[in-house]
Interface confidence: low
Amino acid sequence: MGNSCYNIVATLLLVLNFERTRSLQDPCSNCPAGTFCDNNRNQICSPCPPNSFSSAGGQRTCDICRQCKGVFRTRKECSSTSNAECDCTPGFHCLGAGCSMCEQDCKQGQELTKKGCKDCCFGTFNDQKRGICRPWTNCSLDGKSVLVNGTKERDVVCGPSPADLSPGASSVTPPAPAREPGHSPQIISFFLALTSTALLFLLFFLTLRFSVVKRGRKKLLYIFKQPFMRPVQTTQEEDGCSCRFPEEEEGGCEL
């Protein structure tokens, strides 16, 4: 019994003396934030030199303050206990932890590429000044129809599927244009596809014929050897849009 009582008292004394013992063993633990434990001065707590800080106590060196230069600007000045914080100058935005990089802003409807800001390709959009162009939502995957067409700056707006637009159903969207009875959407789609295909073939053969007459058989062979190219929207300049798969952003302007 007496033995266990002695153990409890001993433990209590150890706990109570821990902090004092620790500071006797390591005088540096007494140095508060804003100072460092200076070994050159017999481990006295010296204030951090200018342009440096220590955010925690007991540090053996102060850390040199971050300098917000170039494309970075100072959001918060460095103090003896906290580092400076940077953000980016107008026309740039922060990237990375603690704004470690600044990346150029683009306009809505554009994305940043290695060659600068480029318009989003047809079928993609970007509604922010940063980030990449994303594909429009495919409404048909959800069995819905396109209510508002997409642009470079905005995604498409999907509406209820045509089947949902029965006379009894209440909807905030305007009713779809009336169709001739007996013509289902599938039949209309089929005829549209057929007409488009026929037109494409006609266009193709006209081009071939023109090429043969104009440039001879050699040119015709060249056309057939070319890999299939994705058609570019005629409304945009040849190199005006950025057609690429989403990839890691380039780290711009890291100082």
Partner: antibody
Framework: QVQLVQSGADVKKPGASVKVSCKAS????????MHWVRQAPGQGLEWMGI????????SYAQKFQGRVTMTRDTSTSTVYMELSSLRSEDTAVYYC???????WGWGQGTLVTVSS | QSVLTQPASVSGYPGQSITISCIGS?????????VSWYQHHPDRPPKLIIY???NRPSGVSDRFSGSKSGNTASLTISGLQAEDEADYYC??????????FGTGTKVTVL
């Protein structure tokens, strides 16, 4: 005892870069700042910059901003000073020196000669 | 001000006292507790002889003493000896977080 041992003399052409090393021993490497100071022939001491080996943070003299890079390798207790776009006026003895507000221990110095 | 101003040379006879001044500004010498002095013999690295304005590292002779008044720091060498012949540099931390040396003073023992 505390020792700072620097790399040997180097000759460089104008426009080139030089990287001088400074290996520390005899103390806790991460507990002391390291400064770089140079002295051109017939000139005084010139402070170039400082590195905190603990975190690797740096501060450079305005004159050398954009041309100097100070790094450290804690595994070998070595600090490095790289100076780029060398000019003839960069011919000097380059010292590493340990300390905070003052420089307690110095390396033996490294003579860098810039000549075409 | 890119450097601290020191007299180019100071001389004295053995046993005499000499004082070297180091003129700075309110953003370096006047601002900082970190004012130090170095002795530099040719072909040797500099040696710290005074730190924190007036403190001497162990092993440095008590003939060397430092002081500061406003933006000017001073180093006094008393009982001048032949081995004191060297270049002397003051230095200070700056409010900008950089470090600056003086122009240097050549001490000649006559």
């Amino acid at each position: 005892q505390v020792q700072l041992v620097q790399s040997g003399a180097d000759v460089k052409k104008p426009g080139a870069s030089v990287k001088v090393s400074c290996k520390a021993s005899g103390y806790t490497f991460t507990s002391y700042y390291m400064h770089w100071v140079r002295q051109a022939p017939g000139q005084g001491l010139e402070w170039m910059g400082i590195i905190n080996p603990s975190g690797g943070s740096t501060s450079y003299a305005q004159k050398f901003q954009g041309r100097v890079t100070m790094t450290r390798d804690t595994s070998t207790s070595t600090v490095y000073m790289e100076l780029s776009s060398l000019r003839s006026e960069d011919t000097a003895v380059y010292y590493c020196a340990r300390g905070v507000g003052e420089l307690w221990g110095w390396g033996q110095g490294t003579l860098v000669t810039v000549s075409s | 001000q890119s450097v601290l101003t020191q007299p180019a040379s100071v001389s004295g006879y053995p046993g005499q006292s000499i004082t070297i001044s180091c003129i700075g500004s309110s953003s370096d010498v006047g601002f900082s507790q970190y004012v130090s002095w170095y002795q530099h013999h040719p072909d040797r690295p500099p040696k710290l002889i005074i730190y924190d304005v007036s403190n001497r590292p162990s092993g440095v002779s008590d003939r060397f003493s430092g002081s500061k008044s406003g933006n000017t720091a001073s180093l006094t060498i008393s009982g001048l000896q032949a081995e004191d012949e060297a270049d002397y540099y003051c230095s200070s931390y700056r409010s900008s977080g950089t470090y600056v040396f003086g122009t240097g003073t050549k001490v000649t023992v006559l």
